[in-house]
Amino acid sequence: TPLGPKWPEPVFGRLASPGFPGEYANDQERRWTLTAPPGYRLRLYFTHFDLELSHLCEYDFVKLSSGAKVLATLCGQESTDTERAPGKDTFYSLGSSLDITFRSDYSNEKPFTGFEAFYAAEDIDECQVAPGEAPTCDHHCHNHLGGFYCSCRAGYVLHRNKRTCSALCSGQVFTQRSGELSSPEYPRPYPKLSSCTYSISLEEGFSVILDFVESFDVETHPETLCPYDFLKIQTDREEHGPFCGKTLPHRIETKSNTVTITFVTDESGDHTGWKIHYTSTAQPCPYPMAPPNGHVSPVQAKYILKDSFSIFCETGYELLQGHLPLKSFTAVCQKDGSWDRPMPACSIVDCGPPDDLPSGRVEYITGPGVTTYKAVIQYSCEETFYTMKVNDGKYVCEADGFWTSSKGEKSLPVCEPVCGLSARTTGGRIYGGQKAKPGDFPWQVLILGGTTAAGALLYDNWVLTAAHAVYEQKHDASALDIRMGTLKRLSPHYTQAWSEAVFIHEGYTHDAGFDNDIALIKLNNKVVINSNITPICLPRKEAESFMRTDDIGTASGWGLTQRGFLARNLMYVDIPIVDHQKCTAAYEKPPYPRGSVTANMLCAGLESGGKDSCRGDSGGALVFLDSETERWFVGGIVSWGSMNCGEAGQYGVYTKVINYIPWIENIISDF
């Protein structure tokens, strides 16, 4: 019996009945065994077929078989109801081998020419399966010459049987207080040969509750408990299960914060699996009762571990833990069923006793000593000598705990000294130097420090003076002895003030003329204003209208008198303003250098002389009455003049203060 070609020889060829194309003889039996490479099959078809026809091909036949299975028994020329001829059919081996047997019996009624067939090896497409047959691969099948291989979708791994896809379903940890988990692919059939482990791990103090929902379908057995596929639930206390079948298991209250769910499947079956909805509970905390004038948020039926609430106070009430203020309050429920902090109080906001107002007072409007939310107080300044700046003095205790003005200011109002008050009224005619009376020049300041000089009080802690008068002390401000509130130069009864800093105009050059002869002294403490100590006003923009030529100004000081000595008593003189050109001309002749009188100066005095300020008066104020406000203001600062005070044809020269208002304001606001 010819074996036919065997792999690895090329597998293709021709088979024919003995004597073909002639008739075949009786009592012939011929067998061919064809073998293809692994992963290949054999294909066979007939180009000629002419055998004796007999019932069930009992006489002459060609039999095709593959392994133990007979693929076909062929005879005749064309198929009948009970016999089969190959016709144009192609036959395929089931594996890689094909057996062909030709047999003729002892006689033929007429001559038959037999058969001719061709064969070849071809690749098996293992991925193609007949309807109703199990697929070659669980997920993806990939054919190639001589074989195939399987692969899996994401989330699966190929089992060692190389065909089944096992789910990668272990290591999932659920940490939320509730959630859902299910068998892989639920509600579609779960994968075979898989072992799934799910963990629920909550914070200590929580207890996990498991509810099986929707449907439950895990392969079972009528007699043995879950031998194929099963679901098990394990806690640190006990094990639940195994579960299988089609009945939803009952709720499981685990009384544990950690749960492990194991699901194991075998290689067969087609079941939809399971779905679990889990929740958690914990020991509830006492229900939080809001303090009076406060409310709890959020409002819940119960509060368990990790739940929290906050307390919010009504407007005008504040959170207090004892005496200590809190901006916010949140308490968290702990595992032992207690809150992590005690309930605060919502106490009415108390702004506390209002601060004392320097040179002023405060009055309780709502009631004596009432300082709580919405209480009203009224600040006022000491009459006559102080006035309230910008503010109406009415303050309300607001919800933020601050006394707040009607303009929303939280700072105290300011009692500013009233400026320019004097006991003296101007007479309108010029008369000789006279002794000042108490309250005539309450802004007058005596400056001692090397030489005698003067100044004028501004506000309650600044002194305006001439730069040349304090130049030597500019780096040693504390050396200046500043006295006020007295008429007598040598009197022991005066108000003492000390300098904190001296500010000399940056345009002033010592010993090189008197341009910009102006300075400010900052006092280290505020002085108390009274009838004998009152600041002078600075000139308003409109002040020039009271300082025209021939308008009367008043100079005061303890400077040299006609007798050539410093005055013991404060003296003053009323003098007219001199035309600027006239004054400039008076100081253009020798010994005065050209340009001595600048636009920053004004001149005052009599052409005939006799009325003038003199050495020792330097830095003092030349003041004018503002007839609109009825207040005195400083128009000039005693600066320089002729060597002989009160000389005819010469005039006293004063620093023109109105030119320096921005400089004064800048220094005072900056320091």
């Epitope: 833990q321 004892g322 005496h323 200590l324 203020p325 809190l326 901006k327 916010s328 902090r341 005690p342 506390g352 933020d400 705990g401 601050f402």
Partner: antibody, heavy 114, light 107 residues
């Protein structure tokens, strides 16, 4: 991590003003709580000086109220203590603390001596 | 001002002992009392607030109780690191005040 750190001169002359600053890191002083100054004379107990709250309100021990000022600089996350007209009795370790007292500075010794 | 009177002012105990320190307020302070531990040259360390609430990180051997005027700090089993001075403190009423301290020494 909330941290408080006191700073300032360790020696102050009598009648002068004691000035200390507490620098806070890890928490904004305007977010919440009361920010306190507490002192402890050598070998003695603790004395509360006062606080400035998250909103800037102050509260002082009445025994020191006339001499004490607590202020803050929110841009630097600092609060400060000024105690005027000091005497030898003000010699102490000065602590800053956040209340509920959960965070304290390490303290700074201030000696009042000429 | 509210006086916080601590007793005893000092005590000697051994490792493993149960130690109780009491603090009496001169008037009702609710539960607004704190306890501090202080070691030489160190800042006070907070232990208890609101009479019975432990600060985080404080060992469970420390416990506080009381309300109104009578308060107690208990150390259930004294450890070597617990030898220190303990202060009570009321923050219920202005001005805030402290107890005079209790020194716990090794017997």
């Amino acid at each position: 991590q909330v941290q408080l750190q006191e700073s300032g001169p360790g020696l102050v002359k009598p009648s002068q003003t004691l000035s200390l600053t507490c620098t806070v890191s890890g928490y904004s002083i305007t977010s919440d709580y009361a920010w306190n100054w507490i002192r402890q004379p050598p070998g003695k107990g603790l004395e509360w000086i006062g606080y400035i709250s998250y909103s800037g309100r102050t509260s002082y021990n009445p025994s020191l109220k006339s001499r004490v000022t607590i202020s803050r600089d929110t841009s630097k996350n600092q609060f400060s203590l000024k105690l005027s007209s000091v005497t030898a009795a003000d010699t102490a370790v000065y602590y800053c603390a956040r209340y509920w007292g959960d965070y304290w500075g390490q303290g700074t010794l201030v000696t009042v001596s000429s | 001002d509210i006086q916080m009177t601590q007793s005893p002012s000092s005590l000697s105990a051994s490792v493993g002992d149960r130690v109780t320190i009491t603090c009496k307020a001169s008037q009702n302070v609710g539960s607004n009392v704190a306890w501090f531990q202080q070691k030489p040259g160190k800042a006070p360390k907070p232990l208890i607030y609101s009479a019975s609430y432990r600060y985080s990180g404080v060992p469970s051997r420390f416990s506080g109780s009381g309300s109104g005027t009578d308060f107690t700090l208990t150390i259930s089993s004294l450890q070597p690191e617990d030898f220190a001075t303990y202060f009570c403190h009321q923050y219920n009423t202005y001005p805030l005040t402290f107890g005079g301290g209790t020194k716990v020494e090794i017997k």
